[in-house]
């Protein structure tokens, strides 16, 4: 008989005969015939696939390497595969998560301007005027420059976006 | 796609003999795999028989082995049911179906394509 041009959805071609794929979390053992159905089977511990298939073979879990800074997220099932994602202070190199690199710290005068994730990386921002870090942070913000004026003191040396403002006393007016 | 139509019912004597047809309009008749199933009243529909695209193999439910002969004329775009020795628990109407995936004979759910089924009634 002349071949079915197509099959249905979740369907496969073979020999011209449609088959039945395999549901998500099986393999393909046997394709089927007219008369005896496509024949699937478990994928095993740490083993996955995550869609209607034809594969003869799972797919193996990713395996988070600790040495690569890496850990387990979400634990792989059959049906899905295992996601990393890196230890505290780092984070992913790619969106596969394959390595991580240390998270990056601002520098003086930079602030945190989003704090790193296990996925992105910190974006520093220059501490604006009126704003100072002096110090080389993966977390602290610019903190805005000391007001003398409350303090009831004036200002005796600047501040920079590296330093702090430095208060002093006013000075009392001569008689 | 196919459209079913099945014809050759009616009421019989027990012991006789009936012959249903089920002519398939559309293309590519010889691609599917077809089979005859029947619905007793209140009850649930049952497989009767099936046969291959090519007509070469055959399968029968063990309550009709032997009085029912299923065949099919793939240049005609019919397949045919052979009755004989019809009995009272015959009674039902009889569906035809056609399929293009692979399984089992008897998997209802298998089947793409229906007819509207004709009526077989056995008097005793």
């Known amino acids: 008989p002349e071949p079915p041009t197509a099959c249905r959805e979740k369907q496969y071609l073979i020999n011209s005969q449609c088959c039945s794929l395999c549901q998500p979390g099986q393999k393909l053992v046997s394709d089927c015939t007219e008369f005896t159905e496509t024949e699937c089977l478990p994928c095993g511990e740490s083993e996955f696939l995550d869609t209607w298939n034809r594969e003869t073979h799972c797919h193996q879990h990713k395996y988070c390497d600790p040495n690569l800074g890496l850990r387990v997220q979400q634990k792989g099932t059959s049906e899905t595969d295992t996601i990393c994602t890196c230890e505290e202070g780092w984070h992913c190199t790619s969106e596969a998560c394959e390595s991580c690199v240390l998270h990056r710290s601002c520098s003086p005068g930079f602030g945190v301007k989003q704090i790193a994730t296990g996925v992105s990386d910190t974006i520093c921002e220059p501490c604006p005027v009126g704003f100072f870090s002096n110090v080389s942070s993966a977390f602290e913000k610019c903190h805005p420059w000391t007001s003398c004026e409350t303090k009831d003191l004036v200002v005796q040396q600047a501040g920079t976006n590296k330093t702090d403002v430095v208060c002093g006393p006013q000075d009392r007016l001569r008689a | 796609q196919v459209q079913l139509v099945e014809s050759g019912g009616g009421l019989v004597q027990a012991g006789d003999s009936l012959r249903l047809s089920c002519t398939a309009s559309g293309r590519a008749f010889n691609t599917y795999t077809m089979a005859w199933f029947r619905q007793a009243p209140g009850k649930e529909r049952d497989f009767v028989a099936a046969?291959?695209?090519?007509?070469?193999?055959?399968h029968y439910a063990d309550s009709v082995k032997g009085r029912f002969t299923t065949t099919r004329d793939n240049a005609k775009n019919t397949m045919y049911l052979q009755m004989s020795s019809l009995k009272y628990d015959d009674t039902a109407v009889y569906y035809c179906?056609?399929?293009?995936?692979?399984?089992?004979?008897?998997?209802?759910?298998?089947?793409?394509?229906w007819g509207q089924g004709t009526q077989v009634t056995v008097s005793s």
């Open positions: 179906a056609a399929r293009r995936v692979g399984a089992v004979p008897e998997r209802e759910s298998a089947y793409e394509h």
């Open positions: 046969i291959s695209r090519d007509g070469t193999i055959t």
